[in-house]
């Protein structure tokens, strides 16, 4: 055959879907690789062909459109499972050609078990909510397309094996969980449950998602230095190894890129000749505040390094603030008989 | 490990309450659900209800609704279960049972409290 | 809701038997299945849950398999410590509901 642009096995794309539920899924072609639409392809005269190769195997082969109640069928550039099963799992392909244009990617589809409290290998999206910021919702998601508008299906919510109804602070409302104040014990998987009718049949759309809460806006604050400061000097003799901490507390910020960094007489160390260490480790509190502390290191220090202005910079969407370390030599003690002996009037 | 601790054995007369406690000691995940279920002499088990006590939600069996309230006090680690207007056929041994947490399927039932009786005599 | 009806009520082994207890439901129940263990005076025991999966501390001799209405534990070779009642429970669907028991006494 004709040679064909091959986009090859979209791993982004790493599809899953629950077994024995509806699954709805668009060719990539037109949302990643292509610029133009379906529409505009199908009106241009190109068909769109699906095929698969079976887990574990290297045979592509044609997708049966003539399954009973058409359990897989192809709509416009999505294909449908009315609904999966679990030897659905493998490598899809749609191709959209004519006689002069070939353009095709392949996804990986793995459908999934689930157990009775919606445990399962499915990788989860989280939700973040701030913590104690008033009404917040979370929506059911990757709902849409499933049932015409005027379908009103039932949606109910579960946290873990239970079914949410009473909970102190947590509402649900159709495709939405309002929490009323998140807190702390909001934490944990919540699971949506749709259920709605199509050609006499029911069908069931489980969705899980993790919520995570964090810390509020409200409270957030530039970045605050708690080492160096002013209390602690670092003071140290030629020859010892000079250590440094900079430890810096981030407020939770959605999106925000919290830096640490150390300047050596305004240079950053890489920029300068002395054999300089910066080990970095980072902590979270329970809603996702960040403690950055970076370990500035000079092996053998020389009384050329004890002065220089070691500085320790912070930076996040909430400001910037910098703090000096105080470095200085240590003075030697004096030498005992010396000092004797002067005492005493020797000359 | 979880224990679950229970109150004592009650003798009540029929169309009183009885109110039977059980303690949570030992290290535990903070979200879990507190179940009770029902043994007559010589029956088999029976599920009355649940909660969840960090988040308050409670759920009964039907069979009953409107005389049977589950209640927990967090700060004691205790959950309560209290039955009202007290039948004979109500003499049963009452138990407390648990999960580690909310998520684990088929394990809401792992630990269980020893037990107390309540024999319901006019 | 769901019924539960174990058969036999009473099943009479010697040690170092095999026992084979049975579980049916009303209704699918897929495999949210657990079995329990209750000896007299105590409190009962969780074995199996996800119908085949034994619970920690539970010894290899106890096995149980099914799926959907029919469901089996079998004991392989019975101890003296397992002369005991022994219940299913289904956790598919609210209310969980346990079966009526089944007895199973030194022959």
């Known amino acids: 055959s004709e040679r064909c642009d091959d986009w090859g096995l979209d791993t982004m794309r790493q599809i899953q879907v629950f077994e024995d539920e509806p699954a709805r899924i668009k060719c990539p072609l037109f949302e990643h690789f292509l610029k133009f639409n379906y529409s505009t392809a199908h009106s241009a005269g190109l068909t769109l062909i699906w095929y698969w190769t079976r887990q574990d195997r290297d045979l592509e082969e044609p997708i049966n459109f003539r399954l009973p109640e058409n359990r897989i069928s192809k709509e416009k550039d999505v294909l449908w499972f009315r609904p999966t099963l679990l030897n659905d799992t493998g490598n899809y392909t749609c191709m959209l050609r004519n006689t002069t244009y070939c353009s095709k990617v392949a996804f990986p589809l793995e459908v999934v078990q689930k157990d009775s409290c919606f445990n399962s290998p499915m990788k989860l999206p989280v939700h973040k909510l701030y913590i104690e910021y008033g009404i917040q919702r979370i929506t059911c998601p990757n709902v849409d397309g499933y049932f015409p508008s005027s379908v009103k299906p039932t949606i109910t919510w579960y946290m873990g094996c239970y079914k949410i109804q009473n909970f102190n602070n947590v509402i649900p409302e159709g495709m939405n969980l309002s929490f009323l104040i998140a807190l702390i014990s909001n934490n944990g998987n919540y699971t949506c449950v749709v259920t709605y009718p199509e050609n006499g049949r029911t069908f069931h759309l489980t969705r899980t998602l993790t919520v995570k809460v964090v810390g509020s806006p409200k409270n957030a604050v530039p970045p605050v230095i708690h080492s160096p400061n002013d209390h602690v000097v670092y003071e140290k003799e030629p020859g010892e190894e000079l250590l440094i901490p900079c430890t810096v507390y981030f407020s939770f910020l959605m999106d925000s890129r919290n830096e640490v960094w150390w300047t050596i007489d305004g240079k950053k160390p890489d920029d300068i000749t002395i054999d300089v260490t910066i080990n970095e480790s980072i902590s979270h509190s329970r809603t996702e505040d960040e403690t950055r502390t970076q370990i500035l290191s000079i092996k053998k220090v020389t009384s050329e390094d004890l002065k220089r202005s070691y500085v320790c910079h912070a930076r996040s969407a909430k400001g910037e603030v910098a703090k000096a370390a105080k470095v200085k030599q240590k003075v030697p003690a004096p030498r005992y008989t010396v000092e004797l002996a002067c005492g005493f009037g020797a000359t | 490990q979880v224990q679950l601790v229970q109150s004592g054995a009650e003798v009540k007369k029929p169309g009183s309450s009885v109110k039977v406690s059980c303690k949570a000691s030992g290290p535990s995940n903070p979200v879990y659900a507190i179940q009770w279920v029902r043994q007559a002499p010589g029956q088999g088990l029976e599920w009355m209800g649940y909660?969840?006590?960090?988040?308050?939600?409670?759920d009964y069996a039907q069979k009953f609704q409107g005389r049977v309230t589950i209640t927990a006090d967090e700060s004691t680690s205790t959950a309560y279960m209290e039955l009202s207007s007290l039948r004979s056929e109500d003499t049963a041994v009452y138990y407390c049972a648990r999960g580690q947490t909310l998520y684990d399927s088929g394990r809401q039932f792992d630990i269980w409290g020893q037990g107390t009786l309540v024999t319901v005599s006019s | 809701e769901i019924v539960m009806t174990q058969s036999p009520a009473t099943l009479s082994v010697s040690p170092g038997e095999r026992a084979t207890l049975s579980c049916r439901a009303s209704?699918?129940?897929?495999?949210?299945l657990a079995w329990y263990q209750q000896k007299p005076g105590q409190a009962p025991r969780l074995l199996i849950y996800g119908a085949s999966t034994r619970a920690t501390g539970i010894p290899a001799r106890f096995s149980g398999s099914g799926s959907g209405t029919e469901f089996t534990l079998t004991i392989s070779s019975l101890q003296s410590e397992d002369f005991a009642v022994y219940y299913c429970q289904q956790y598919n669907n609210w209310p969980w509901t346990f079966g009526q028991g089944t007895k199973v006494e030194i022959k």
């Open positions: 209704q699918s129940v897929s495999s949210n």
């Open positions: 909660i969840i006590p960090l988040h308050g939600q409670v």
